[in-house]
């Protein structure tokens, strides 16, 4: 079992453990091995203490266990004789946050270890580009996050503050939308969402490329490159090419780095190069028609980044077509 946890050591038999919502965690506690071991794990709030898990007379005792911990806790029973009193905690909820004390008594020692459990969540955010009538918007969205994240915007690498923030979920986890009006701008934008508890940061970057003017029946090359500053070599990512039309997005191609599979939804679409180095995801669109005019969006996304590149393509009638009319 993979348990994601961060251990922070603080003085006086106290540890801070950070877990993730819905995942499992181990609350550590150790003692010098001894006979006739008694273990009591308790949760302490401002008013009360609740029994989480007990062990004595050689077995786990759950008669007095608080109902919120039912079927969610266990000890490493065959390791108790070696001094391991750690608690295995399943399916963390935000309500599990708080102070846990582990009392261990043996014939020769009596100790208490304190564990401060903090629970965080950070579902991968998204950056979306939307057109509403004549306005263009960038939206940074995180569906589930706790605690409240730090959201920052930059325009051409300079921090900006004017964004519209919407939040739902009064106690957490929170769902947050941060929207920026970018109508008429040719700047590049960056949105960063940071969960300081989980030490996790996500960055969304949006770049508008110069408009491309092409003639009917020609082909167009749409550039989209993965920037090494953003992606580490072993990181899984996906690439989606789509077209924006009247505020609606339709997918043209989809690539998954883990399987190296590409799915094309438009037969005239193809990669510019072979995807050997997995960094250049430029596209060719052949046999252009007037209806191909519009905005083309390349989205490269991983758990840590989203890179959006926008191309505006203007397809003009060829001379022959014009003279035919």
């Amino acid at each position: 079992i993979f348990l994601s946890a961060f251990f922070t050591y603080v003085p006086m038999n106290e540890q801070i453990i950070i877990g993730r919502l819905g995942e499992d965690i181990i609350l550590p506690s150790s003692f010098e091995r001894g006979s006739e071991v008694v273990i009591h794990w308790k949760y302490q709030d401002s008013y009360n203490s609740y029994n989480v898990h007990s062990y004595y007379k050689g077995s786990g005792r759950l008669e007095s266990q608080d109902t919120r911990y039912a079927n969610r806790t266990s000890l490493f029973y065959n390791e108790i004789q070696n001094g391991n009193a750690s608690l295995f905690f399943r399916r963390l909820s935000l309500l599990d946050e708080g102070i846990y004390t582990c009392y261990v008594g043996t014939a020769i020692q009596a100790i208490t270890n304190k564990v401060v459990l903090k629970v965080g969540v950070f579902l991968t955010p998204m950056m979306k580009y939307e057109k509403r009538n004549t306005n263009s918007f960038l939206i940074c969205n995180v569906l589930s996050v706790y605690p409240r994240p730090i959201i920052t915007w930059k325009m051409d690498n300079t921090p900006i503050s004017e964004n519209n923030m919407q939040e739902t979920g009064s106690l957490g986890p929170f769902s947050i939308n941060s929207t920026l009006n970018i109508t008429g701008s040719n700047s590049s934008y960056e949105c960063t969402i940071e969960n300081s508890l989980l030490k996790q940061t996500w960055t969304g970057r949006w770049t508008m490329k110069d408009g491309l003017h092409k003639m009917q029946s020609e082909h167009v090359s749409l550039s989209c490159e993965l920037v090494n500053d953003y992606f580490s070599p072993n990181q899984d990512f996906k690439v989606t090419w789509s077209r924006m039309e009247s505020g609606i997005s339709s997918i043209l191609a989809y690539y998954l780095s883990s399987s190296q599979n590409t799915t094309f939804y438009e037969s005239r679409f193809s990669w510019n190069k072979e995807l050997k180095n997995q960094s250049d995801f430029s596209m060719n669109l052949t046999d252009l028609s007037l209806s191909d005019s519009g905005e083309y969006l390349c989205n490269i996304s991983s758990d840590e980044y989203t890179l959006l590149t926008i191309h505006t393509v203007h397809v003009e009638p060829s001379q022959e077509t014009a003279s035919d009319n």
């Epitope: 010098e32 008694v38 007379k57 014939a107 020769i108």
Partner: antibody, heavy 116, light 107 residues
Framework: QEQLQQPGTELVKPGASVKISCKAS????????MHWVKLTPGQGLEWMGT????????SYNQKFKGKATLTADKSSSTAYMQLSSLTSEDSAVYYC?????????WGQGTTLTVSS | DIVMTQSHKFLSTSVGDRVSITCKAS??????VAWYQQKPGQSPKLLIY???TRHTGVSDRFTGSGSGTDFTLTISSVQAEDLALYYC?????????FGGGTKLEIK
């Protein structure tokens, strides 16, 4: 032969602090927890707290948190309990006792008198 | 906290008698109870732990019994040297609590 030696008496003024010692011999000091117990005619025996000299892990009775501070010096096999901001309520016999959850060897006790 | 109550502050008995000292826990402590004897001018001595296990060197005249919340220390044939204060203690969880003590007097 396991033994715990404590000073017989301590006389201190109200508001002052006192550090009571408990010197262990005849066993491996760092392997056993050392407890401190208060005896008064009114309250009987009260467990104050414990220290495990092996890693200096301490546990206190909430009632004595802030009043008592437990320490241990492995090099001299001595446990200490410091009592601060003394009042007449702190006048009592204080025992150190060795053990885990039960106490198999006790010191002779230190009679603390708080008086001006 | 798990509080221990010894209902009898004093018990009067004669040499050779069988006497039982009782102790009640405020909640279930399984068998995690110890008994101590304190003679006048001395420090307490451990007699029994885990409700019924005799400590090294303790006379077999002393027997402990009970589980859950009710516990008993029995002296099968009281001797003059048994004149003392007897305390029970729960060793199930911290803070450890002692009973108020029962003083055994010899008639």
């Amino acid at each position: 032969q396991e033994q715990l030696q404590q000073p017989g008496t301590e006389l201190v003024k109200p508001g002052a602090s006192v550090k009571i010692s408990c010197k262990a011999s005849g066993y491996t000091f760092s392997s056993y927890s050392m407890h401190w117990v208060k005896l008064t005619p009114g309250q009987g025996l009260e467990w104050m707290g414990t220290i495990y000299p092996g890693n200096e892990n301490t546990s206190y009775n909430q009632k004595f948190k802030g009043k008592a501070t437990l320490t241990a010096d492995k090099s001299s096999s001595t446990a200490y309990m410091q009592l601060s901001s003394l009042t007449s309520e702190d006048s009592a016999v204080y025992y150190c006792a060795r053990g885990g959850y039960y106490f198999d060897y006790w010191g002779q006790g230190t009679t603390l008198t708080v008086s001006s | 906290d798990i509080v221990m109550t010894q209902s009898h502050k004093f018990l009067s008995t004669s040499v050779g008698d069988r006497v039982s000292i009782t102790c009640k826990a405020s909640q279930d402590v399984s068998t995690a109870v110890a008994w101590y004897q304190q003679k006048p001018g001395q420090s307490p001595k451990l007699l029994i732990y885990w409700a019924s296990t005799r400590h090294t060197g303790v006379s077999d005249r002393f027997t402990g019994s009970g589980s859950g919340t009710d516990f008993t220390l029995t002296i099968s044939s009281v001797q003059a040297e048994d004149l003392a204060l007897y305390y029970c203690q729960q060793h199930f969880d911290i803070p450890y609590w002692f009973g108020g003590g029962t003083k055994l007097e010899i008639k």
